[in-house]
């Protein structure tokens, strides 16, 4: 293959891969027809002048996961055909000016996971065809004005995981073609008005895990094409009324892990395409009528781990397409009989870890497609007659950790549970809390005659049986439709693997495993 170095492997497709700790310099001679060169996991510490001079046909060059800390300005001379250059996961602190000069075809430049302390306008001034620039995982503290002014074709810019404390409102002004901007995991406390005004084609903006306290009212008003907006894990305590007003294409909005106390009226909308709204881990105490009424296509609404004690009966107006509603770990004691009336397509609802003492008999009356209901760890002593009768698709019902009162009033519920045991799961069954002589005994097998009879014995001896369709699987707990183990955060749909943080803390929302990844 035109002379393949011994430390490398060369394929017929003009691909060369050189790996291993024994490599301390760019191997030679490299095949003149090489189109792709990867130098990975070596002990190379520097790149000298023109090590790639004889492979001018090179299109992709990956020099990743090495000990590289120094590069001579002329290292990439004669690579005029190069389209992809990755120097990620090295130990670069400084980039020489002119390093990328002559790389007229360069479209992707990956400088992520180094130790870069600064970038300057002169670094990228020659890269007029650049479409993707990855700078995440460095030590950048500021971006000078003009740094990206020549990158007019840039579509993707990642500045995440740096140490940025502020952003100039002018730094992105010429990036009219930018589609993805990632600024997550920095130290930004506020973003000046106008910062994103020039980004008319922006589709994704990642601002999560900063220290942003306040959003300017018109911050996103020019970003009409924005589809994904990540604002989670900041210090946002209030949302200006018009902040999301001009985002008709938005389909995912994450606001979890902030300090929101209330949701201003009309704050969400109109957002006809929003599919997911993540609001867990805030300080929301009540939900007024119509707070989500502009979100006609919303399918996932996560409100868990707040302090919600009151939900107005019209709070969920307009959410006719909602599939998943997470309200667990709040302070709910009461639910108005009409509160879920609009949620005709709801499949999963998690209400566990609240203080519900009773449920209205018609609470699920319009929600015929419910498949999973989480009611564990509340203050329920009984449930109204026939509350689940019409829920033919129900295959998961969690009722444990409630103080069930096993007097004769419990008979209808007990009999229904007996007929529908598979829906309760096998992990934990509901047990009696009172009277004392039956405390701790399974509600399903309890002999109610032993218990103290109640004053009022209902005439109807049992809940009518909800048909248990044989084609509806009774899921064992490990594959439950609405697992009580939950994701900490939505999987933010990144192509850069370095930005995905895998976590095993799945304790945030009660949803389908399909959606919890």
């Amino acid at each position: 293959y035109h002379g393949c170095p011994s430390e490398c492997t060369c394929s017929r497709a003009s691909q060369v891969e050189c790996t291993g700790a024994r490599i301390v310099a760019v191997p030679t001679p490299l095949p003149w027809n090489a189109m792709s060169l990867q130098i990975l996991n070596t002990h190379i510490t520097e790149l000298n002048e023109s090590p790639f001079l004889n492979i001018s046909a090179l299109i992709a060059l990956r020099i990743e996961k090495n000990e590289l800390s120094r590069i001579t300005p002329g290292a990439f001379r004669n690579l005029g055909s190069l389209r992809y250059l990755s120097l990620a996961n090295n130990k670069l602190q400084v980039l020489p000016i002119g390093l990328f000069q002559g790389l007229d075809s360069l479209e992707s430049l990956l400088l992520s996971s180094n130790q870069l302390l600064q970038i300057q306008p002169a670094h990228f001034s020659q890269c007029s065809n650049l479409k993707e620039l990855q700078l995440h995982g460095n030590h950048l503290e500021y971006i000078p004005d003009g740094a990206f002014d020549h990158l007019v074709g840039l579509t993707k810019l990642n500045l995440g995981k740096n140490s940025l404390t502020h952003i100039s409102p002018r730094v992105f002004q010429h990036l009219g073609n930018l589609q993805v901007l990632r600024l997550y995991e920095n130290r930004l406390t506020d973003i000046p008005m106008g910062t994103f005004d020039g980004l008319v084609n922006l589709q994704e903006l990642a601002l999560q895990q900063n220290q942003i306290g306040l959003l300017s009212p018109g911050l996103f008003h020019n970003n009409h094409n924005l589809q994904r907006l990540y604002l989670s894990n900041n210090h946002i305590s209030q949302l200006p009324p018009s902040v999301f007003m001009q985002l008709p294409q938005l389909n995912r909005l994450t606001l979890f892990g902030n300090s929101l106390k209330e949701l201003s009226p009309g704050i969400f909308g109109p957002m006809p395409n929003l599919r997911e709204l993540w609001l867990y881990d805030n300080h929301i105490s009540s939900l007024p009528d119509n707070v989500f009424s502009n979100l006609r296509q919303l399918q996932v609404l996560i409100l868990s781990r707040n302090q919600i004690s009151f939900i107005s009966p019209g709070a969920f107006n307009g959410l006719t397409e909602l599939r998943e509603l997470s309200l667990h770990t709040n302070a709910l004691q009461d639910l108005d009989g009409n509160v879920f009336r609009m949620l005709a397509n709801l499949q999963n609802i998690s209400l566990q870890n609240n203080r519900l003492r009773q449920l209205p008999g018609n609470i699920f009356a319009n929600v015929n497609g419910l498949m999973a209901i989480q009611l564990q760890n509340n203050q329920l002593e009984n449930l109204p007659l026939g509350i689940f009768d019409h829920l033919g698709k129900l295959c998961e019902l969690r009722l444990y950790d409630n103080p069930w009162r096993c007097d004769s009033d419990i008979l209808p519920l007990r009999n229904w549970l007996l007929l529908n045991q598979p829906r309760l799961g096998t992990d934990t069954v509901p047990v009696c809390f009172s009277p004392a002589n039956v405390r701790g005994q399974s509600l399903i097998i309890i002999n109610v005659n032993v218990a103290v009879p109640s004053v009022h014995v209902p005439e109807v001896p049992s809940y009518p049986e909800t048909p248990w369709y044989p084609d509806t699987p009774s899921y064992p707990d490990t594959t439950s439709v609405s697992s009580t183990t939950e994701l900490t955060s939505p999987v933010e749909d990144y192509t850069d693997l370095t930005t995905i943080q895998v976590t095993d803390d799945r304790s945030v929302w009660g949803m389908t495993q399909a959606q919890s990844g």
């Epitope: 009324p241 201003s264 009309g266 007024p288 009528d289 009424s293 019209g314 107006n317 009461d334």
Partner: antibody
């Protein structure tokens, strides 16, 4: 159909208390919030508070806090509003009202006139 | 507390007239505004909820509009039975508050 029937008119002396009842029918009493609203002569309507009959939880307008107590008797499907330390400006018609599909008042009692006079 | 300022406080009109009543909230209440009609000695009757939705049984001549802080109730062609007092109410945040009322009288 939903009906709210209130107790009759009352005349009270300043400093006394009054307890007005509201009997609900036509729906499951414990499942829906019941509110109390008053209207002094020639004045705007004033929301006083609500009760959730299923649990007995209440929320009051700060203006009346400490003087108003809303209770319920689930066996009688009846809500009560007691106002203490009455003053002449408490002379008003007191209404119970139930929300519909939102926190607006769809169903109203006929009203109870409470007159406070020495 | 959110103040609801209604205007005019009274108006005189004839049968067939178009009548417009406005209500201004002291802060943003979204669309969480209701309108009621009250006749002497009677309880208020719900006309409009969520700023623009007619309650069941309410004639189509009644319409509501607005959002945020400015709201309007319109009676397109006044009928004899429409002479009454009209109130707006915000139910976005506690305590729920009402406007001072607009008395519609016969000219």
């Amino acid at each position: 159909q939903v009906q709210l029937v209130q107790s009759g008119a009352e005349v009270k002396k300043p400093g006394a208390s009054v307890k007005v009842s509201c009997k609900a029918s036509g729906y499951t009493f414990t499942d829906y919030y019941i509110n109390w609203v008053r209207q002094a002569p020639g004045q705007r309507l004033e929301w006083m508070g609500w009760i959730y009959p299923g649990s007995g939880n209440t929320k009051y307008n700060e203006k009346f806090k400490g003087r108003v107590t809303i209770t319920r008797d689930t066996s009688a499907s009846t809500a009560y509003m007691e106002l203490s330390s009455l003053r002449s400006e408490d002379t008003a018609v007191y209404y119970c009202a139930r929300w519909g599909y939102g926190a607006y008042f769809t169903y109203w009692g006929q009203g109870t006139l409470v007159t406070v006079s020495s | 507390d959110i103040q609801m300022t209604q205007s005019p406080s009274s108006l005189s009109a004839s049968v067939g007239d178009r009548v417009t009543i406005t209500c201004k909230a002291s802060q943003n209440v979204g669309i969480n505004v209701a309108w009621y009609q009250q006749k002497p000695g009677k309880a208020p009757k719900l006309l409009i909820y969520s700023a623009s939705y007619r309650s069941s049984g309410v004639p189509s001549r009644f319409s509501g509009s607005g959002s945020g802080t400015d709201f309007t109730l319109t009676i397109s062609s006044l009928q004899p039975e429409d002479f009454a007092t009209y109130y707006c109410q915000q139910y976005n945040s506690f305590p729920y508050t009402f406007g001072g009322g607009t008395k519609v009288e016969i000219k």
